[in-house]
Interface confidence: low
């Protein structure tokens, strides 16, 4: 039949060439002379001339050595024609398979591979994968089948078989326990790839395994015991710097210390923070310490790391004995601000109150008192007893010194410590009103027409407080009532002044006496300008010859 089975040809053949491979034969050659030809890549198209055919015999010829890694299979067509060029057979498929020779070594994809693994991991932990390729056939032959192995390990510590490599996948794993970054931070493995599944050509590369830091070392206090002296009352005072050592990688979470006060700070007086550079624990006072209440604190501080421990590690504990140093503390007025009610205008020398301070110190210190600020100079203070007395006239209505009925005085207490310390107190005198001011009209000058005059409305003011104010009463004195009339309007605390009789144009004094609800009387002279005019006037019309 006009068919050819696939032809296998080894690559890298030595010849001689041309080399006969197979004979094409048509059974039509009984009837007529047949001429054979081939077409296709490798024959009449690139790569041309690799194959040829003997025109009359049909022998398929190989003209040169083949390279499987370049072309692994050729597909040609065989043709048979008669002498007159007529085709006697359909084109026939000719498959030429190039069989592999082990003519390539394995090649690693990198000269140096890098991987990493945590220290202390269990055997079996995967580290990294390396890859080598081989251009030869790994499907039908072992020529391209690569087997991996570790040739050497540096350093050989704690021993020379810390890692293994999977012979077919190239996965490097830990095979032994004992990886310790603090002892060996990096291993260099020389790895091999061998084709023929380990029996052929070998190539080498390097795998660098970095041992990553795990928190397998606890921070340890060095020293473990501290003694400190802190002045009482100092807030934010640095008590002590606690030092730790940690064998893990500096500035990593496994090295950075976390401090915790675990005992001795019942009053929450202390706080501890980690210094970002030195890793020390900075113990400071969160609140002021009180020597008189407790003169010694024993603190227990534990240290761990920012990262959790990867194995059970003992927690280091430091003991800090804090001695509180006595400080001469300032006397404290009790209460710090004292409110006292006192009537205005009471006689000089009269007692206002006793205002004293306590000294927090244990020694019975002598305290002396004096007035620090007394804006009006109204008070005096006994230096020994703290007795406050009146030294001037207390005037509730004096707006220079009194605000909202309160007169504010600052007093001072000084102890006899070394050095002396001072404390201040505030004395707030609430001045009780006395009816010491009569009502006063405003304005005190008026202009009015002598014909059909408009009544003048005057506002009444009284500096005192209720009930020493309205209702007010008005009375005209010294014969002012002959020409004038005064009436109080209780609704709006005003007095209405009216001209009863004709007065010639001139200036007159109107004697107006106003009294308040407490009958405190105040005489005010109103200066009235009477003008020759009708009704409303602001100013007398010209000509005006005043007398």
């Amino acid at each position: 039949d006009w068919v050819v089975a696939p032809i296998s040809v080894p690559e890298n053949g030595k010849g001689p060439f041309p080399q006969r491979l197979n004979q094409l034969k048509s059974n039509k050659d009984r009837d007529t002379k047949i001429f054979y030809s081939i077409t296709g890549p490798g024959a009449d198209s690139p790569p041309e001339g690799v194959f040829a055919v003997e025109k009359e015999t049909g022998w398929l010829l190989l003209n040169k050595p083949l390279d499987r890694e370049e072309i692994a299979k050729y597909e040609l067509f065989g043709h048979a024609v008669s002498e007159n060029g007529a085709s006697v057979e359909d084109p026939m498929n000719i498959s030429i398979i190039v069989t592999d020779q082990n003519d390539h070594k394995p090649k690693f994809t990198q000269d140096t591979f890098r991987g990493s693994v945590l220290e202390g991991v269990l055997p079996g932990t995967s580290v990294m994968q390396v890859t080598a390729t081989d251009e030869d056939d790994a499907i039908h032959t072992y020529n391209g089948v690569v087997a991996y192995s570790i040739h050497s390990q540096e350093p050989k510590d704690p021993h020379d078989l810390m890692f293994t490599i999977h012979r077919s996948t190239g996965t490097i794993s830990v095979i032994s326990s004992g990886l310790d970054r603090e002892k060996v931070p990096e291993y260099t493995l020389t790895i091999q790839a061998t084709d023929m599944d380990g029996d052929g050509s070998t190539t080498t590369a390097v795998a660098v395994v970095e041992i990553l830091d795990a928190n397998d070392n606890a921070p340890v206090f060095d020293p473990q015991k501290y003694e400190s002296h802190v002045p009482e009352n100092a807030v934010g005072h640095e008590v002590q710097r606690l030092t730790v050592t940690d064998l893990d990688a500096p500035n990593s979470p496994a090295w950075r210390a976390t401090y915790l006060i675990v005992g001795g700070d019942d009053g929450d007086h202390f706080t501890i923070a980690t210094h970002p550079e030195s890793n020390q624990g900075i113990l400071t006072t969160r609140k002021g310490l009180d020597f008189e209440a407790k003169n010694q604190h024993t603190l227990y501080v534990e240290v761990t790391n920012e990262a959790p421990f990867v194995l059970k590690l003992p927690t280091s504990t430091a003991t800090i004995v804090v001695h509180v140093e006595d400080v001469n503390e300032a006397p404290v007025f009790v209460p710090p601000s004292k409110v006292v009610e006192v009537q205005e205008g009471i006689p000089t020398g009269e007692a206002v109150c006793v205002y004293t301070a306590k000294d927090p110190d244990k020694e019975n210190q002598k305290i002396s008192y004096r007035i620090l600020r007394d804006p009006a100079g109204w008070l005096a203070m006994d230096p020994d007893s703290g007795q406050v007395t009146v030294a001037g006239t207390l005037d509730r209505e004096d707006e220079r010194f009194v605000r909202n009925n309160i007169y504010e005085v600052m007093v001072l207490a000084v102890d006899n410590g070394s050095p002396p310390t001072t404390g201040t107190g505030t004395l707030l005198l609430t001045l009780i009103d006395v009816n010491d001011h009569g009502p006063v009209p405003e304005p005190r000058e008026i202009t009015i027409c002598n014909q059909s005059p408009e009544s003048q409305v005057l506002n009444i003011t009284d500096k005192d407080l209720s009930p020493h104010t309205s209702p007010f009463q008005a009375q005209l004195t010294d014969d002012s009532d002959i020409y004038w009339m005064a009436e109080v309007n209780e609704k709006d605390d005003t007095v209405v002044l009216s001209l009863k009789k004709f007065l010639k144009q001139d200036t007159y004094d109107v004697h107006l006496s106003l009294s308040d609800h407490g009958n405190k009387e105040q005489l005010t002279v109103i200066r009235a300008t009477v003008c020759d005019c009708h009704g409303h006037v602001e100013k007398c019309p010209d000509p005006w010859k005043g007398g």
Partner: antibody, heavy 123, light 113 residues
């Protein structure tokens, strides 16, 4: 004699926050770490978390996103808050004292326990 | 998390006889630096909280009768009651405190045969 007593509502609605307090008497409240443990009806014990003497805490990772343990020294009380509760949080809740402050005391072992309080999560 | 597994789940023993409860941890509870096993045993009677019996795997808590003893190291531990008394009927739990979170065994119910 040290005594611990849990208290709080016996019924909590789903999705709400469970709040319990543990009152300590007969000893300084901040002298020892305090643990919270729970026990679903008819089941075993599950450790919830611990508060150390300095106020630091350590929680069970399975509950960490929902749990808060705190202390109010003025009231001699510890508190447990568990948010977004479901029926699976129905249990007897215990507070228990660690037997020591330091690792070398065996502080993971718990020597004094409260009587426990049953919390039911139901709508 | 470290898994604690107790065996058996329940146990019936005659009065005066020895009772043995086993506890196995998924990893070693022995810390080499101090050679201590971070394991405790508790007894829980119905309607009551657990009571600490043993810590450090073998140290008896004060006030616990000496018929209770703990042994074992690494991953395998045993609680032994040398002569069972009626008041020993309870559920017994082991607990590891080697690492967080602390975990308990599922419990062993001890009854009288």
């Amino acid at each position: 004699q040290v005594q611990l007593q849990e208290s709080g509502p016996g019924l909590v609605k789903p999705s709400e926050t469970l709040s319990l307090t543990c009152t300590v008497s007969g000893g300084s409240i901040t002298s020892y770490p305090i643990n919270w443990i729970r026990q679903p009806p008819g089941k075993g014990l599950e450790w919830i978390g611990v508060i150390w003497t300095g106020g630091g805490t350590n929680y069970n990772p399975s509950l960490k996103s929902r749990v808060t343990i705190s202390v109010d020294t003025s009231k001699n009380q510890f508190s447990l808050k568990l948010s977004s509760v479901t029926a699976a949080d129905t249990a007897v809740y215990y507070c228990a004292r660690s037997r020591g402050v330091y690792d070398f005391d065996g502080r993971g072992a718990m020597d004094y326990w409260g009587q426990g309080t049953l919390v039911t999560v139901s709508s | 998390d470290i898994v604690m597994t107790q065996s058996p789940d329940s146990l019936a023993v005659s009065l005066g006889e020895r009772a043995t409860i086993n506890c196995k941890s998924s990893q070693s509870l022995l810390y080499s630096s101090n050679q201590k096993n971070y394991l405790a045993w508790y007894q829980q009677k119905p309607g009551q909280p657990p009571k600490l019996l043993i810590y450090w795997a073998s140290t008896r808590e004060s006030g616990v009768p000496d018929r209770f003893s703990g042994s074992g190291s690494g991953t395998d531990f045993t609680l032994t009651i040398s002569s069972l008394q009626a008041e020993d009927v309870a559920v017994y739990y082991c607990q590891q405190y080697y690492s967080y979170p602390y975990t308990f065994g599922q419990g062993t119910k001890l009854e009288i045969k």
